[in-house]
């Protein structure tokens, strides 16, 4: 059956995929084209209750911080 990531395994997965960037459990506000009435989707819904691929996991990584210019 489809494999899901829950609990500590899910945190480990995010830590691996996102590295130093860090990650969110819910998509940041304004992410995608969700309407105001739509409930916020979280990674638990997408990767624990259902199976998800690596691209889906990567969507919960925090954005890369731009390098500071001198």
């Amino acid at each position: 059956g489809p494999e899901t990531l829950c609990g500590a395994e899910l945190v480990d997965a995010l830590q691996f995929v996102c590295g130093d960037r860090g990650f969110y459990f819910n998509k940041p506000t304004g992410y995608g084209s969700s309407s105001r009435r739509a409930p916020q989707t979280g990674i638990v819904d997408e990767c624990c209750f259902r199976s998800c691929d690596l691209r889906r996991l990567e969507m919960y990584c925090a954005p890369l911080k731009p390098a500071k210019s001198a």
């Epitope: 494999e3 990531l5 500590a8 395994e9 480990d12 830590q15 691996f16 590295g19």
Partner: nanobody, 118 residues
Framework: QVQLQESGGGLVQAGGSLRLSCAAS????????MGWYRQAPGKERELVAT???????NYADSVKGRFTISRDNAKNTVYLQMNSLKPEDTAVYYC????????????WGQGTQVTVSS
């Protein structure tokens, strides 16, 4: 410190198979997550497949159904079985692990070259 040594790369014809191995040594008591990345010339490094200590696997869409990741926790080794290889799979393949006791620090192998000829 964790050391990673990849092996199994090489030159193969399209449609062929290769099995990559990555053996971890050193401070390896807590490696909850392991995986494979690849980097083709002139392209960004791409995450290919990951596996948890409980052997839950995740794949990039581009390799799903063709590649299989597995691990042997007793040997601290992760494998990538690559079937139905395509020329676009040509890249340097890197093994990586996360070490929980260092706050998720990621260790990288040196990489192994996979070349798929048409």
């Amino acid at each position: 410190q964790v050391q990673l040594q990849e092996s199994g790369g090489g030159l193969v014809q399209a449609g062929g198979s290769l099995r990559l191995s990555c053996a971890a040594s050193g401070n390896i008591f807590d490696l909850p997550y392991m995986g494979w990345y690849r980097q083709a010339p002139g392209k960004e490094r791409e995450l290919v497949a990951t596996i948890s200590i409980g052997s839950t696997t995740n794949y990039a869409d581009s390799v799903k159904g063709r590649f299989t990741i597995s691990r042997d926790n007793a040997k601290n080794t992760v494998y990538l079985q690559m079937n139905s290889l395509k020329p676009e799979d040509t890249a340097v393949y890197y093994c990586a692990v996360v070490h929980r006791s260092t706050g998720g620090y990621k260790y990288w192998g040196q990489g192994t070259q996979v070349t798929v000829s048409s």
